[in-house]
């Protein structure tokens, strides 16, 4: 199966009369209603493969999926930048690809969480994702939708850079969150969320181990390793972010 990081074979030439869709939302806008894998080509980017989820709210690009621990998410900066995993299973699309989709537009970020009892939570944020020059900073541009309200972090307006164990951009001076936890994430103070943490099929006894797991503090708590997560993004209409 192709790795998410692999570009499409450049030998395939797009016709002079046609082009690849820019993103999943454009596919939805031209009438596509089938979810699945599509080749897209955002402006100025090489083509790449994405998972599109078509819903009543339009077309969403899946940027992260966890559900079985089959893929190691404790990877360095370059891996998180390029993307990794299996498009049919667990994967991280890649920060550069996500940024090529969103450009300078504000976007909706949907976060789907599931615990081991079958309970699910859907959160929606209005966000702006910066480029590599900002360490792919994620800024909440509006309050979140969903049960958890504004208790989710980062707070509106705060911009949080992405961090990995080899590129520490978190908001703590005394600690490397990615190193002491696991995986790459928009770490603020290490304790609010980490959907790219270590996958635990059973809850470890030691809290030291447990803190490395996949968690969303304001939902099931800091030390509850979640069973499944999906992150989806959808750029908003044309006007640029302020």
């Amino acid at each position: 199966l192709p790795e998410m990081a692999q570009p499409v074979d450049p030998a395939h030439n797009v016709s002079r009369l046609h082009r690849l869709p820019r993103d999943c939302q454009e596919l939805f806008q031209v009438g596509e209603r089938q979810s699945g894998l599509f080749e897209i080509q955002p402006q100025g980017s090489p083509p790449f493969l994405v998972n599109c989820k078509m819903t009543s709210d339009g077309g969403w690009t899946v940027i992260q999926r966890r559900h079985d621990g089959s893929v190691d998410f404790n990877r360095p900066w370059e891996a998180y930048k390029a993307g990794f995993g299996d498009p049919h299973g667990e994967f991280w699309l890649g920060l550069e690809k996500v940024h090529s989709i969103t450009g300078d537009r504000n976007s909706r970020l949907a976060v789907q969480l599931r615990d081991w009892d079958g309970n699910a939570e859907l959160l929606q944020f209005s966000v702006h994702l910066g480029g590599e020059d900002t360490a792919y900073s994620l800024q909440l541009t509006a309050p979140v939708a969903g049960q958890l309200g504004a208790t989710t972090v980062p707070p509106s307006g705060l911009s949080v850079p992405f961090s990995t164990w080899d590129q520490d951009h978190d908001l703590r001076r005394d600690k490397n969150c990615a190193k002491s936890l696991s995986g790459g994430w928009w770490f603020g103070t290490c304790s609010h969320s980490n959907l790219n943490g270590q996958y635990f099929r059973s809850i470890p006894q030691q809290r030291q181990k447990l803190k490395k797991g996949i968690f969303w503090k304001t939902w099931r708590g800091r030390y509850y390793p979640l069973q499944a997560t999906t992150m989806l993004i959808q750029p908003m209409a044309a006007e640029a972010a302020s």
Partner: nanobody, 120 residues
Framework: EVQLVESGGGLVQAGGSLRLSCAAS????????TGWYRQAPGKQRELVAS???????TYADSVKGRFTISRDNAKNTVHLQMHSLKPEDTAVYFC??????????????WGQGTQVTVSS
Amino acid sequence: EVQLVESGGGLVQAGGSLRLSCAASESIFSLYVTGWYRQAPGKQRELVASITSGGSLTYADSVKGRFTISRDNAKNTVHLQMHSLKPEDTAVYFCNGRSIGVDDMPYVYWGQGTQVTVSS
């Protein structure tokens, strides 16, 4: 404009197999979905199978496990392998492709169709 030309239809006995091919006049790489539809006499055209540019497959319930769609970007062709054919599979089979133009408009292309007749 992309021209789609179907081939491989014919008369076959129930339980037999056929392989339909759809050749495109230019690169199918930019066709985000390609598929096969069929229309039996007096009935509406219905989706048989489709494949996205990334390889995701959709099949009509009536053909699941019997038909397989595939796409060859290098040869600009789409195939429909049909096994365990039944009389109710008798129809004209049409190739379909959908794309976005450089003018940002959606385009839908259809072939002329190829007749498949399954005798009992």
